[in-house]
Interface confidence: low
């Protein structure tokens, strides 16, 4: 215990990752609007931290829409330097175990686990689905193995960054390696559940792209978005098959998507999520 305390003397100075976007609209889900045009635009994908192309209908929508890839990167992606360096760290608790729980700024509302340095145990907390920090685990076991009873060296491929507490420069910040999967599936499986505007309480299912599972939600009966299925089976059929291991090579699955008041267009997404 004394060694552990000595090793982490600057724990209270740890700053959270440089991850909150400069503009709140960068966290908005892509919205192509209700109109019928077919205009190429770019949006910032909060899940992948990358600017991606989408087809804009020509009216309404939201501020997460840019005419060029460069403009999108300038406004939203510059806070996310991409690093893919292979990293290792030695036996003992990684620094991020001592960060406070951080729900992030999104509204995905997911039960996750974090290491509570006060109680010295892993506990549940509510995660919004994006951003936050690395003290965030899908399972209690993963949290315990990483922060309560860490074993020997971990080796990870990770693109996340952390502020160096000594000179405030960006450094690579490792995390215990989850299994990384690529989601190659229809774009309507990505947005968070949207209750809509009416008063009903119908049980529907939405695909939670952060955890890779279909979860129930209460639908108001009107409005909302296309991530809305009448049965768990329908949700799984539409979205779950989009999961393939990142190591498997192959083309993206292109899914035809029919949109109201608009010609059929082909959209696909590629994002990386954790899967247990």
């Amino acid at each position: 215990a004394a060694e552990e305390d000595e090793e982490f003397t600057n724990i209270t100075d740890i700053k959270p990752p440089l991850q909150k976007p400069t503009h709140s609209f960068c966290a908005m889900k892509v919205d192509d609007g209700p109109c019928r045009a077919y205009i190429k635009r770019f949006f910032f994908n909060i899940l992948t931290h990358q600017c991606e192309e989408f087809i804009y209908g020509g009216c309404e929508g939201n501020e997460n829409r840019f005419e060029s890839l460069e403009e999108c990167k300038e406004k939203c992606a510059r806070d996310y330097p991409k690093m893919t360096t292979k990293l290792t760290f030695q036996k003992g608790k990684p620094d991020f175990c001592f960060l406070e729980e951080d729900p992030g700024i999104c509204r995905g509302y997911i039960t996750r686990y974090f290491y509570n340095n006060q109680s010295k145990q892993c506990e549940r907390f509510k995660y919004g689905g994006c951003l936050g920090n690395l003290n965030n685990f899908e399972s209690l076991e993963e949290c315990k193995n990483t922060c309560e009873n860490p074993t020997s060296d971990f080796q990870v491929d990770d693109h996340r960054t952390q502020l160096n507490t000594v000179n405030n420069t960006l450094i690579n910040q490792p995390t215990k390696a989850p299994r990384r999967w690529a989601f190659h599936g229809p774009s309507w499986c990505l947005p968070p559940a949207d209750r809509g505007l009416c008063q009903a309480n119908e049980i529907r299912f939405f695909y939670n792209a952060i955890i890779g599972k279909c979860r129930p939600f209460k639908y108001s009966g009107c409005g909302g978005n296309e991530n809305n299925f009448t049965s768990k089976k329908a949700c799984i059929t539409a979205c779950k098959k989009g999961f393939i291991p990142k190591s498997i090579k192959g083309g993206l699955i292109k899914t035809k998507r029919k949109k109201k008041k608009q010609p059929v267009k082909i959209t696909y997404v590629e994002t990386f999520v954790k899967k247990t």
């Epitope: 729980e101 729900p103 999104c106 509204r107 509302y109 039960t111 506990e123 549940r124 907390f125 509510k126 919004g128 399972s139 209690l140 076991e141 968070p192 559940a193 209750r195 049980i203 939405f206 979860r215 129930p216 939600f217 209460k218």
Partner: antibody, heavy 122, light 111 residues
Amino acid sequence: EVQLQQSGTVLARPGASVKMSCKASGYSFTTYWIHWVKQRPGQGLEWIGAIDPGNSDATYSQKFKDKAKLTAVTSASTAFMELNSLTNDDSAVYYCSREVYYGYDGDYFDYWGQGTTLTVSS
Amino acid sequence: DIVLTQSPASLAVSLGQRATISCRASESVSVHGTHLMHWYQQKPGQPPKLLIYAASKLESGVPARFSGSGSETDFTLNIHPVEEEDAATYFCQQSIGDPWTFGGGTKLEIK
């Protein structure tokens, strides 16, 4: 119909251990967390901990982490709570409850067992 | 731990009148616009029964005379008009973080 059926009244000696059960029916047992709550006579409700029957992940209140052990047997759709080193303070009604999760509405207890009464006496 | 303080500890309300029960949390129980505060009713010899979830949403089958409101740290349960069968103890409960905690309870008596 969703039901949580708990085992009957238990009388135990100080220092002993007891194991109570909570049998779920009417829904997919592995989909929802099962929580355990303590209520002493004429008093409030205290959260003990919860278990995810799907993978046996368990989480405990700091106060009960050395007192209670939560387990689940999916083939029997039954959750168990074992209480050890019993004292008079453990005399209470213990409830199991199902945690439900719906989108943004939060998670809460929508169904409860009828309770198991534990009396610790020498 | 998040401490939930309920007030009053007990109250007596005439039939047909309004009962108001307050629950104050020691820190915010709201996240991303969801208020993780829930209300239960408990009658002697019975387990608690869910009335209101997410601060203001009425559980299926619960009469519309029950309503909930509030956000962050201050929440209220209203019963109007009060009926005989509403005599019970009412608990608030938060689920924002472990350990989940309950208020001390409010005993409602019908005059």
